[in-house]
């Protein structure tokens, strides 16, 4: 009878993560008596995957009944494959021996490659908000994919971006890989509703790429423009002054009225109007009792937006034509009926 040969017919096997890998192995003879073992890798550091004789291998099942003497099919199935299972698997025939079984013949090996899907891309923007015309960086990360080949694209509102740098790690062979990309985006005043999208395409995704998004509303700060105007006189000695705060984002805004440098009233933007581009407008007004002033009044609308240094706009109110009324020392009427926004 010819000497036993161990046949592993598949040079390589490709399996998707989470699926079951079948590693085929047959022997050409029933002689000698002894167990089959499966190893990953060769040499002294090889890892035992299955031993016909003894041990517990919960992920491994045999294709045929290996308990029987007449069996020559030593194929195994390994369940719930992960990228960590990648490697070359050897089917090795031992012969019964003492004190230990003796390695008799090995198969040529089967390389198991694992296809693993990339994780959902995570896009993160800068830690602090930036204003229009500034360039900000966005990063995109995805992990755990195999094989290494992968394509990453950046989009802003559907338009592909070109200013980005991408790295796939590690550079050498690995069970799985990660991708990291940084894109530069120039902000415009219209970007409150804009989105930055990172798109990852991989062989495991069957043409349906994964996307991660970041809303520029989390990144942009549009500073307000201020306009202070004097309205027609409502009563004989009252002047209505309005401060229009336009095109700001985000909404967080505090407005302070000053009369000749003294704080008259402070209020927080609450009921605002939203523009089509996502920015906000707000208006505050002040009733000034001109009879309370002997001299001209400098009215200042001071706005602190989103924790930034205050910006202000002033308006000079001429009061020379109005003699001061006796007993009045209140420059601005701050009654509840007056403390309302006009829009």
């Amino acid at each position: 009878e010819e000497e036993l040969q161990v046949i592993q017919p598949d040079k390589s096997v490709l399996v998707a993560a989470g699926e079951t890998a079948t590693l085929r192995c047959t022997a050409t003879s029933l002689i000698p008596v002894g167990p089959i073992q499966w190893f990953r890798g060769a040499g002294p550091g090889r890892e035992l995957i299955y031993n016909q004789k003894e041990g517990h291998f919960p992920r491994v099942t045999t294709v045929s009944d290996l308990t029987k003497r007449n069996n020559m099919d030593f194929s195994i199935r390994i369940g719930n494959i992960t990228p960590a299972d990648a490697g070359t698997y050897y089917c090795v025939k031992f012969r019964k021996g003492s004190p230990d079984d003796v390695e008799f013949k090995s198969g040529a090996g089967t390389e198991l490659s694992v296809r693993a899907k990339p994780s959902a891309p995570v896009v993160s923007g800068p830690a602090a908000r930036a204003t229009p015309q500034h360039t900000v960086s966005f990063t995109c990360e995805s992990h755990g994919f195999s094989p290494r080949d992968i394509t990453l694209k950046w989009f802003k509102n559907g338009n592909e971006l070109s200013d980005f740098q991408t790295n796939v790690d590690p550079v050498g062979e690995s069970v799985s890989y990660s991708i990291h990309s940084t894109a530069k985006v120039v902000l415009t005043r219209e970007d409150v509703h804009s989105q930055v999208i990172c798109e990852v395409a991989h062989v495991t995704l069957q043409g349906d790429p994964l996307r991660g998004t970041a809303n520029l509303s989390e990144t942009i700060r549009v500073p307000p423009t201020l306009e202070v105007t004097q309205q027609p006189v409502r009563a004989e000695n009252q002047v209505n002054v309005t401060c229009q705060v336009r095109k700001f984002y985000p909404q967080r805004l505090q407005l302070t009225w000053l009369e000749n440098g003294n704080v008259s009233r402070t209020e927080t933007a609450s009921t605002v109007t939203e523009n089509k581009d996502g920015t906000y407008n707000w208006m505050s007004w002040l009733l000034v009792n001109v009879s309370a002033h002997r001299d001209d009044v400098k009215l200042t609308c001071q706005v602190e937006h989103d924790g930034q240094p205050a910006v202000s706009k002033s308006h000079d109110l001429k009061v020379s034509a109005h003699p001061k009324e006796q007993g009045s020392n209140t420059a601005a009427e701050n009654t509840g009926s007056n403390e309302r926004n006009i829009y």
Partner: antibody
Framework: EVQLVESGGGLVQPGGSLRLSCAAS????????MHWVRQATGKGLEWVSV???????YYTGSVKGRFTISRKNAKNSLYLQMNSLRAGDTAIYYC????????????WGQGTMVTVSS | DIQMTQSPSSLSASVGDRVTITCRAS??????LAWFQQKPGKAPKSLIY???SLQSGVPSKFGGSGSGTDFTLTISSLQPEDFATYYC?????????FGQGTKLEIK
């Protein structure tokens, strides 16, 4: 059904010969090592001989040179030719299949009685 | 030849008991150890191979363990049909050898 049936036992005088047969059915006979095991009345089991798939043979020391194991795969049959029989060879003779991957016995015949007596 | 020594030679137990029979080899047998059950007038029946693997069709109340030279057969809950003689056997190297047997009797 997997089955082993021994035959050929009987009474024989010391120094005589006897040929035991074991008829196998229900499995591919040629793919298994086959063994003979004996048991003297009221005693324990004693392994006697084996013939491998390739025809290789082994014997226990007390029967070497006197007993010959053989097989005819075409007839699904195992044989034990016993010569120069002694009183100490008196026993029930069982054939057994090395049915497990490691040649562990999994199937036994019902046995045939060999009595060596004058 | 490898000597196989079983203990005890005989054992009395009751239905429902858990019993243990031990077998010692005179040298390492690389776990190539089998256990057999034999009832009077019958052929032996295979129970365990490679020290701990259960033969097909054998109930799981039979369990084998051990390695090196010391091995154990455990029957977890004795039933009337379990009273018989039990043999261990090494089949690591020729000549294969059996233990002298343990007779399990009803108390």
């Amino acid at each position: 059904e997997v089955q082993l049936v021994e035959s050929g036992g009987g009474l024989v005088q010391p120094g005589g010969s006897l040929r035991l047969s074991c008829a196998a059915s229900g499995f591919t006979f040629s793919s298994y090592d086959m063994h003979w095991v004996r048991q003297a009345t009221g005693k324990g089991l004693e392994w006697v001989s084996v013939i491998g798939i390739a025809g290789d043979t082994y014997y226990t020391g007390s029967v070497k040179g006197r007993f010959t194991i053989s097989r005819k795969n075409a007839k699904n049959s195992l044989y034990l030719q016993m010569n120069s029989l002694r009183a100490g060879d008196t026993a029930i003779y069982y054939c057994s299949r090395g049915g497990n991957w490691d040649d562990a016995f999994d199937i036994w015949g019902q046995g045939t009685m060999v009595t060596v007596s004058s | 030849d490898i000597q196989m020594t079983q203990s005890p030679s005989s054992l009395s137990a009751s239905v429902g008991d858990r019993v243990t029979i031990t077998c010692r080899a005179s040298q390492g047998i690389n776990n190539y150890l089998a256990w057999f059950q034999q009832k009077p007038g019958k052929a032996p029946k295979s129970l365990i191979y490679t020290a701990s693997s259960l033969q097909s069709g054998v109930p799981s109340k039979f369990g084998g363990s051990g390695s090196g030279t010391d091995f154990t057969l455990t029957i977890s809950s004795l039933q009337p049909e379990d009273f018989a003689t039990y043999y261990c056997q090494q089949y690591n190297s020729y000549p294969y050898t059996f233990g002298q047997g343990t007779k399990l009797e009803i108390k």
